[in-house]
Interface confidence: low
C-alpha cells in the first residue's frame, strides 16, 4: 500500500445538547473520526480512565466521505449516552480514542496532551457543573 | 429491537473545541423508521444503530449527520427521511 494514501483520523467529541438533557434526562456525546485512509480503525470510549461499553453505539463500518471515489477517505461516528446527572458531574471525564492501523504495525495513535494541537487522535470532554 | 417509548428528536451538538463541523443527532425513534442517506455529498449521515444503556434498561435508535458546510442546519439534515416537524429541538443561543 502506497504510503501517500495513509491519512490518520481527526477526532472530535461533541457535547450533549441541553435540549436533549432537559427533554429526556439523558445526555448523548458524539465522537467523530474523520478523514482517514485506509479504513482500519477501532474506536473506544473511556470514562474516568476506564473503557466503557454500556451506553455505547458505534457505526458497524466506516462511511466513505466521497462514495464516488475509489480511494475516498473514511469517517466513523460513535455515541455515548449517560444520565443527565452523570454528565453534569464536573468530576466525570469522557474521552473518545481511535486506534488507526494504516502502517505495517498496529499503532495506537494517542496524542500527547501537553500542548494544544489541532489534530488529536483522542478527544475529550468534561462534565458540566454550571448547567 | 423493540423501542418501548419512541420519542423521536433531532438535537444539535457542539464540539468541545473550536470546530467547523456541525453535528446533528437523530435519536429515540421507532425501529420501523429508516434513515436515508443524504443526496448532498457534503453532508454525511450514518446508518441507524442501537444503543443499550444496560444500567437503565433502556435502548434507543440513533443516527448522526454532520457537515462542514457553513449553512448546514439540523432542520434539513434528515430531510430525505420521514421525520415529524415537531422533532427538531433548536440549540439555545447562549452556550451553557
Amino acid at each position: 500500500e502506497d504510503l501517500k494514501k495513509v491519512f490518520p483520523p481527526k477526532v472530535a467529541v461533541f457535547e450533549p445538547s441541553e435540549a436533549e438533557i432537559s427533554h429526556t434526562q439523558k445526555a448523548t456525546l458524539v465522537c467523530l473520526a474523520t478523514g482517514f485512509y485506509p479504513d482500519h480503525v477501532e474506536l473506544s470510549w473511556w470514562v474516568n480512565g476506564k473503557e466503557v461499553h454500556s451506553g455505547v453505539s458505534t457505526d458497524p463500518q466506516p462511511l466513505k466521505e466521497q462514495p464516488a471515489l475509489e480511494d475516498s477517505r473514511y469517517s466513523l461516528s460513535s455515541r455515548l449516552r449517560v444520565s443527565a446527572t452523570f454528565w453534569h458531574n464536573p468530576r466525570n471525564h469522557f474521552r473518545c480514542q481511535v486506534q488507526f492501523y494504516g502502517l505495517s504495525e498496529d499503532d495506537e495513535w494517542t496524542e500527547d496532551r501537553d500542548k494544544p494541537i489541532t489534530q488529536k487522535i483522542s478527544a475529550e470532554a468534561w462534565g458540566r457543573a454550571d448547567c | 429491537p423493540y423501542i418501548q417509548n419512541p420519542d423521536p428528536a433531532v438535537y444539535q451538538l457542539r464540539g468541545s473545541k473550536s470546530n467547523d463541523t456541525s453535528v446533528c443527532l437523530f435519536t429515540d425513534f421507532d425501529s420501523v423508521m429508516n434513515v436515508s442517506q443524504s443526496k448532498d455529498s457534503d453532508v454525511h449521515i450514518t446508518d441507524k444503530t442501537v444503543l443499550d444503556m444496560r444500567s437503565m434498561d433502556f435502548k434507543s435508535n440513533g443516527a448522526v449527520a454532520w457537515s462542514n458546510k457553513s449553512d448546514f442546519a439540523c432542520t434539513s439534515a434528515f430531510k430525505d427521511s420521514v421525520i415529524p416537524a415537531d422533532t427538531f429541538f433548536p440549540s439555545p443561543e447562549s452556550s451553557c
Partner: nanobody
Framework: EVQLVESGGGVVQPGGSLRLSCVAS????????YGWYRQAPGKEREKVAH???????DYADSAKGRFTISRDESKNTVYLQMNSLRPEDTALYYC???????????WGQGTLVTVSS
C-alpha cells in the same frame, strides 16, 4: 517534532554506486516508518523505498534489485544503498518519516544525486 537530514549525494558515473544517509533527531521514538523518495527535474516526487520499524521493506519497481533500504536504530539513521546507477536516477532524493503523533509526516531537505558520464 522530528528533524531529518540527508547526506551522501553527489556525482557518479553510470554503473556506479552511492550510499545515502538520513539522520533523524527529535521525537524519533514516535516514528514508525521511513521512506526514500526522489524528484527529477520537471517530474513529480516518487517513491523509491520504504522501511517500517519492523524492518519490512517495499521498493518501487525502478529500484528493485539495484537499491537497498536499511536502518540503524542505534544511530537513528536510515540508508539507501544505490548500485548500478543510471542517468535516469538523477534526482533530488528526500527522506521521509511518519510519526505516531501530529503532524505525522516529516520530510528532509533532500540530497542531490547526479548520474552522468
Amino acid at each position: 517534532e522530528v528533524q531529518l537530514v540527508e547526506s551522501g549525494g553527489g556525482v557518479v558515473q553510470p554503473g556506479g554506486s552511492l550510499r545515502l544517509s538520513c539522520v533523524a533527531s527529535g521525537a524519533v521514538h514516535k516514528i514508525n516508518f521511513y521512506g526514500w523518495y526522489r524528484q527529477a527535474p520537471g517530474k513529480e516526487r516518487e517513491k523509491v523505498a520504504h522501511i517500517s520499524i519492523g524492518d519490512q521493506t517495499d521498493y518501487a519497481d525502478s529500484a528493485k534489485g539495484r537499491f537497498t533500504i536499511s536502518r540503524d536504530e542505534s544511530k537513528n539513521t536510515v540508508y539507501l544503498q544505490m548500485n548500478s546507477l543510471r542517468p535516469e536516477d538523477t534526482a533530488l532524493y528526500y527522506c521521509r518519516a511518519l510519526s505516531r503523533i501530529w503532524p505525522y509526516d516529516y520530510w528532509g531537505q533532500g540530497t542531490l544525486v547526479t548520474v552522468s558520464s
